[in-house]
Amino acid sequence: KSPIFGPEEVNSVEGNSVSITCYYPPTSVNRHTRKYWCRQGARGGCITLISSEGYVSSKYAGRANLTNFPENGTFVVNIAQLSQDDSGRYKCGLGINSRGLSFDVSLEVSQGPGLLNDTKVYTVDLGRTVTINCPFKTENAQKRKSLYKQIGLYPVLVIDSSGYVNPNYTGRIRLDIQGTGQLLFSVVINQLRLSDAGQYLCQAGDDSNSNKKNADLQVLKPEPELVYEDLRGSVTFHCALGPEVANVAKFLCRQSSGENCDVVVNTLGKRAPAFEGRILLNPQDKDGSFSVVITGLRKEDAGRYLCGAHSDGQLQEGSPIQAWQLFVNEESTIPRSPTVVKGVAGGSVAVLCPYNRKESKSIKYWCLWEGAQNGRCPLLVDSEGWVKAQYEGRLSLLEEPGNGTFTVILNQLTSRDAGFYWCLTNGDTLWRTTVEIKIIEGEPNLKVPGNVTAVLGETLKVPCHFPCKFSSYEKYWCKWNNTGCQALPSQDEGPSKAFVNCDENSRLVSLTLNLVTRADEGWYWCGVKQGHFYGETAAVYVAVEERKAAGSRDVSLAKADAAPDEKVLDSGFREIENKAIQDPRLFAEEKAVADTRDQADGSRASVDSGSSEEQGGSSR
């Protein structure tokens, strides 16, 4: 599919001008290559009329130009003094006319309307309001006032001062007679429809002395604004319909076959399932304007979008609207990243977030998409060290691996963590991406004690058991804080006995805290990584208390007496539900997480065959 994009249809009137914008991916080659505008012949060729290399056909001499805007990835063709002979099929493109890097444009030039003398022309947008003014003389001040519409050869009564209203205008028309001083009546028509366009006649009086005034009403369908965005990127539709509809329900819909327009999102709470998790409606300003952001753009998102206002929250005849034609460029600069990441209860996920590598200094954010309200994505963590209070100890945003990607790690997963999350920065708004976290059946791969109490001045050793599947990974311990997780020295204690059916490649890696101080209290993570790519993590809270009896503490996974909320497994390990701990000191010490099997694919959820963009909770 060609990545060149422009308007499919351009309509104008004889004598007027048009400006046609064509979009292209702004690669270095594209920016500098030849741009052209050509007319398609009946036998398939395309004859150049104007190009960026200076050529102008004699047909266009003195009335057309082509300007390239390489920084925007656009070029614009302006054509003046249009005639009906200019109607036809054209292409705007890059390189050689026959190469296929082009977009088809249909230009339709119509004759101007043949208007009667003394005709007032009213040009109004679809869905808006028009006021037709009708002057009269004093002798007709007390006589009947009326407005007719010319239908074919016959005038049809639309409204009159005796109270008649044509059924086609019910509920959206009124006739106002100005105060005695002004010899003028006016007809106001709201929620204009395309069918309202035409010739009108207003009249005061019914005899030969009546006053008449001709009016021509042109109802304009909004020209769609062209929007060119990258696959996997983000688009924002800014919708400003005017203060008169500030209190009316707003919607964004996508035109399907014919005149149908399927609601994508509206302010009444409706949202199309295809956009779940990747659309937000920003609340409206006082003037009634609002915006809709769609992220994770797909090929099938391309098409015509309308925003509008109507009490039903969907397109109806007479809704004021704004239109866009969205083109999704498949030659995207935005890299593929998993759209679904899976983890198990008690386990963890590591999410990779792409950003524009030109903006390495921008603030990175990770927020939780909220479906209940149309426009919320509350911040959970940022690259400046802010972490939402409820996520302390289990969430971290790392600038690694860098160069256009950052990492977010979330552990101590529960079913409540399932949902959609957005990666964004305070820079390029096109680089907003969405990831869905799914919680699946299985056990965490890393085994650590639940939470641990250390004694001031003593030594504490905390174990972390890694199954053999992580034999080739780097294993680490770190201390969590709100700016990341600071690496700590750890000791490899040899093979772990925490896994059944697991060979010598399983590992027990311990964290040792010597001469424990109050500053050692906090969250500790053990985890695996490969270079700058992070995999699973497990968290332990270490509380610090006053000395009771001398000696060092060596924390193990198993303990003879199981707490009431734990069940003892055959192997003597205890299994608990690893809940997100608000204040770990309120919980019994040394809760354990264990598993009697090596769940080779337990927490590293397997990739669904239906999707090429899913990753498990483990590292890549």
Epitope: N282, V293, Y365, P378, L379, W386, K388, A389, L424, N426
Partner: nanobody
Framework: QVQLVESGGGLVQAGGSLRLSCAAS????????MGWFRQAPGKEREFVAA????????YHADSVKGRFTISRDNAKNMVYLQMDKMKPGDTAVYYC????????????????????????WGQGTLVTVSS
């Protein structure tokens, strides 16, 4: 809700120094950033300085750069504005402001110097610089 109370205003001679304090109370865990603004008689409220609550990244208006310094003490929920080399043009009511963490997409692109970025405001403290 977050409550903000400014203190430290007063009369100072040109070239002198003053330190303003702002005490935050209430739901301080929701604070994402804080700032100082000022409003001179008959003029609009203008940005002076801002600081991010967690990282302490600072922003200063060009008109005060090199003279004013914003700082914070998270443990005490305090923000300070150290004003040195003061000028008569610095005379104004100084307001402390706090912002919540972003929630709406538009919040993520708001700048620390924009008044609309802030959700909570103090009553203000008057600073007069005499020549």
């Amino acid at each position: 809700q977050v409550q903000l109370v400014e203190s430290g205003g007063g009369l100072v001679q040109a070239g002198g120094s003053l330190r303003l304090s702002c005490a935050a109370s209430g739901r301080t865990s929701s604070i994402y950033g804080m700032g100082w603004f000022r409003q001179a008689p008959g003029k609009e409220r203008e940005f002076v300085a801002a600081i991010s609550w967690s990282a302490g990244r600072t922003y200063h208006a060009d008109s005060v750069k090199g003279r004013f310094t914003i700082s914070r003490d998270n443990a005490k929920n305090m923000v300070y504005l150290q004003m040195d080399k003061m000028k008569p043009g610095d005379t104004a009511v100084y307001y402390c402001a706090a912002r919540r963490a972003p929630e709406l997409l538009s919040d993520y692109t708001q700048k620390p110097e924009e008044i609309g970025t802030y959700h909570y405001w103090g009553q203000g403290t008057l600073v007069t610089v005499s020549s």
